[in-house]
């Protein structure tokens, strides 16, 4: 199995009441604008075939995609939460910059690509859905990386 290195985040990142609350508020605000409740981006299908030790690396990929392809382009929306949450998530991304896995990560890239394809296929509503799932992104990073 591939070996994960530097795929760790300190628990304190997920224990800051103010920014945690803002992240969940942003997710709630966006989910109110999401009318496609049958589609779930972050869930069982994303983790399918990925071992526990690989999940932080998987979530790093999802976090980077969410920042670059969703949050930055949508940064003028859902204020004031967006302007506080984006820098927080960017810091987490930066702390995971040295997170890699040794060996084949094709199965992980395949799962991440399905998520990306779903977001792209849904267009702007896919981006809104991704923002609405920031609570799930937060939980997944916490569960996988601490």
């Amino acid at each position: 199995a591939p070996i994960s290195s530097h795929c760790r985040l300190d628990k304190s990142n997920f224990q800051q009441p103010y920014i945690t609350n803002r992240t969940f508020m942003l997710a709630k605000e966006a989910s109110l604008a999401d009318n496609n409740t049958d589609v779930r981006l972050i869930g069982e299908k994303l983790f399918h075939g990925v071992s526990m030790s690989e999940r932080c690396y998987l979530m790093k990929q999802v976090l980077n995609f969410t920042l670059e392809e969703v949050l930055f382009p949508q940064s003028d929306r859902f204020q004031p939460y967006m302007q506080e949450v984006v820098p927080f998530l960017a810091r987490l991304s930066n702390r995971l910059s040295t997170c890699h896995i040794e060996g084949d990560d094709l199965h992980i890239q395949r799962n991440v690509q399905k998520l990306k394809d779903t977001v792209k296929k849904l267009g702007e509503s896919g981006e809104i859905k991704a923002i609405g799932e920031l609570d799930l992104l937060f939980m997944s990073l916490r569960n996988a990386c601490i």
Epitope: F24, D38, R40, I42, E44, H48, D135, M139
Partner: antibody, heavy 119, light 107 residues
Framework: QVQLVESGAEVKKPGASVKVSCKAS????????ISWVRQAPGQGLEWMGW????????NYAQKFQGRVTMTTDTSTSTAYMELRSLRSDDTAVYYC????????????WGQGTLVTVSS | DIQMTQSPSTLSASIGDRVTITCRAS??????LAWYQQKPGKAPKLLIY???SLASGAPSRFSGSGFGTDFTLTISSLQPDDFATYYC?????????FGGGTKLEIK
Amino acid sequence: QVQLVESGAEVKKPGASVKVSCKASGYTFTSYGISWVRQAPGQGLEWMGWISAYTGNTNYAQKFQGRVTMTTDTSTSTAYMELRSLRSDDTAVYYCARDRGYYDAFDIWGQGTLVTVSS
Amino acid sequence: DIQMTQSPSTLSASIGDRVTITCRASEGIYHWLAWYQQKPGKAPKLLIYKASSLASGAPSRFSGSGFGTDFTLTISSLQPDDFATYYCQQMGEWKAAFGGGTKLEIK
């Protein structure tokens, strides 16, 4: 419309097994999972476990580990819950509920199946 | 495992009353909490998910609040149809846990 329809009431003897079915309709079965919840007479709700209709992966409550088996048949959009070595305190209404498993609520429930364990 | 504690276990109220039921988690669960209503002989019905989001078809007089360990379900003006038992539930990672229930009775 979206619904879950469970099999009929069962009467079983102590030590026997019961298998309850839950047929889903009105939604893409493999996009969700199924949780099983039971309720003894006059008591509260007790979560028993969850099965993915996508992969068949299961997660059972510790209390039922080794005694319960949850399965799905995607060709008929049906979930099954088998409980073995029945005791009188297993007498309860057994509900299936739609649940994606990963931080999800139970938005659709079956009507319930009464299982009576009596000698 | 996370334990959910509901209070009160029984509550007597009158039509038109504002009613509050509380639920406490044994550890922080962020906003991963749902509320259900159950009437005798019927399956539970989802009212609130993610602590404060109103489920489809649930009347707007129901509202939820809370974050972390302490949560509340509020009925703004009690209607005859609201006399039932209410359960909170922790929405977990492939796991769930219910509170013991609150029976809402007519005063």
